[in-house]
């Protein structure tokens, strides 16, 4: 008789989760020679230890500390790109502009990107059926706490000019409830960070509005200014051209506004 299992509102753990995490770790240590000291089995053991046998609504940042320690990584603090609701373009950008880094370009972000995971209290099983939804079930679930933890650490590490890519097609270009708005903004260190520069990405071909004047951007500016960090904003009217010009900056069409 199958034992009763808690039914959560969110999707279950990504299939082949352990194998995926291990394979991603192996690949990452191949691609990044500076991370070849990392033991991928230890990383998986620490990842597993953060949520296995624990109630999936009672996860803490402390649970992830062993994993954070193993995944400690130095990225150039002045080359950090944050993003909100526009992950794909941010990742396309750092794939071209190799000296800049999103969270998902770090080992821990790379391991967990697009994955879901949770366990069950008092059993060593991974729950592949369902996991807690942040809104409908609980916020202290394994996935949310992981991203809160790594996002906080990433923002704390930033210095000089920090860039953030924001989605100009959304009703709230800056959303206080996003990871960027609720975690990263509040963990930038004013003694290290001089400026936060927002890049507002336009969606429509003919959209020539200055989205830097959007009320939510003004709200972001206010929050940042109160934290003694300067704020600047740029419209990226043509994201496709923007990427093309990052690839080929000497192209003659790249001198005009993008």
């Amino acid at each position: 008789v199958p034992r009763w299992r808690q039914q959560w509102s969110g999707p279950g753990t990504t299939k082949r989760f352990p194998e995926t995490v291990l394979a991603r770790c192996v690949k990452y240590t191949e691609i990044h020679p500076e991370m070849r000291h990392v033991d991928c089995q230890s990383v998986w053991d620490a990842f597993k230890g953060a949520f296995i046998s624990k109630h999936p609504c009672n996860i803490t940042e402390e649970d992830y500390q062993p994993l954070m320690k193993l995944g400690t990584q130095t990225v150039p603090c002045n080359k950090i790109l944050l993003w909100s609701r526009i992950k794909d373009l941010a990742h396309q950008f750092t794939q071209v502009q190799r000296d800049m880094f999103t969270l998902e370009d770090t080992l821990l972000g790379y391991l967990a990107d697009d994955l879901t995971w949770c366990g069950e209290f008092n059993t060593s099983k991974i729950n592949y059926q369902s996991c807690p939804d942040w809104r409908k079930d609980c916020s202290n679930n394994p996935v949310s706490v992981f991203w809160k933890t790594v996002s906080r650490r990433f923002a704390e590490a930033a210095c000089d000019v920090v860039h953030v890519m924001l989605n100009g097609s959304r009703s709230k270009i800056f959303d206080k409830n996003s990871t960027f708005g609720s975690v990263e903004v509040h963990n930038l260190q004013p003694e290290k960070v001089q400026t936060l520069e927002a890049w507002v990405i336009h969606g429509g071909r003919e959209d020539s509005r200055d989205l830097c004047q959007d009320p939510t951007i003004k709200e972001l500016e206010s929050i940042i200014s109160k934290r003694n960090i300067q704020f600047s904003c740029k419209n990226i009217y043509r994201p496709d051209k923007f990427l093309q010009c990052v690839k080929n900056p000497e192209d003659s069409s790249c001198t005009s506004e993008i």
Epitope: Q41, S42, L70
Partner: antibody, heavy 120, light 112 residues
Framework: QVQLLQSGAELVRPGVSVKISCTGS????????VHWVKQSHVKSLEWIGV????????TYNQKFTGKATMTVDKSSSTAYMELARLTSEDSAIYFC?????????????WGQGTSVTVSS | DVVMIQTPLSLPVSLGDQASISCRPS???????????LNWYLQRPGQSPKLLIY???KRFSGVPDRFSGSGSGTDFTLKISRVEAEDLGVYLC?????????FGSGTQLEIK
Amino acid sequence: QVQLLQSGAELVRPGVSVKISCTGSGYSFTNYAVHWVKQSHVKSLEWIGVISPYYGDTTYNQKFTGKATMTVDKSSSTAYMELARLTSEDSAIYFCARRFEGFYYSMDYWGQGTSVTVSS
Amino acid sequence: DVVMIQTPLSLPVSLGDQASISCRPSQSLVHSNGNTYLNWYLQRPGQSPKLLIYKVSKRFSGVPDRFSGSGSGTDFTLKISRVEAEDLGVYLCSQSTHVPLTFGSGTQLEIK
């Protein structure tokens, strides 16, 4: 299943070079470094070096710098090792081995070995 | 380079007996990441080495539980609880903590 298939035995004259190959299958070749190891009666097993197929970057045992050159061809999932200016001391069995999942500098699966005999 | 001293050179055993092989590296094998990369391989005649034990005591997939590894610092041991015919061959210890990686000279396990 993971397999590393090496090229056949070589009988070569002193002073020339030889290039041996190691083709990986049953796993994502690009994501796993390939180690090379020499086995001779004199010195048992000696680590020559390791190459990462992703970018082709290498780490050599100093002892084999100038003697061995490791390369990869990602399109054919094949790693190569060229041995230069051969002498009788280079007569040995050469193994390729895949990096262990857990750690870059450990090895799990090995090829069957390629015998190199240097003789005039 | 780390020198791996393996003893004995040859180990005659009867089938069903316990066998014990020692490996002593010339320096600590504790890596900066906290792990100890001491591995054991079995090389049967005419074959390539097969991984048995990694990180001192972890059995590689498919390795029978009659094989066990132990030790710390600069003193490591491989034990075979009940020797079977298929266990015969040369046992090699290796370290992958320090570059260059190095191997012991091998222990020949043979029938008494």
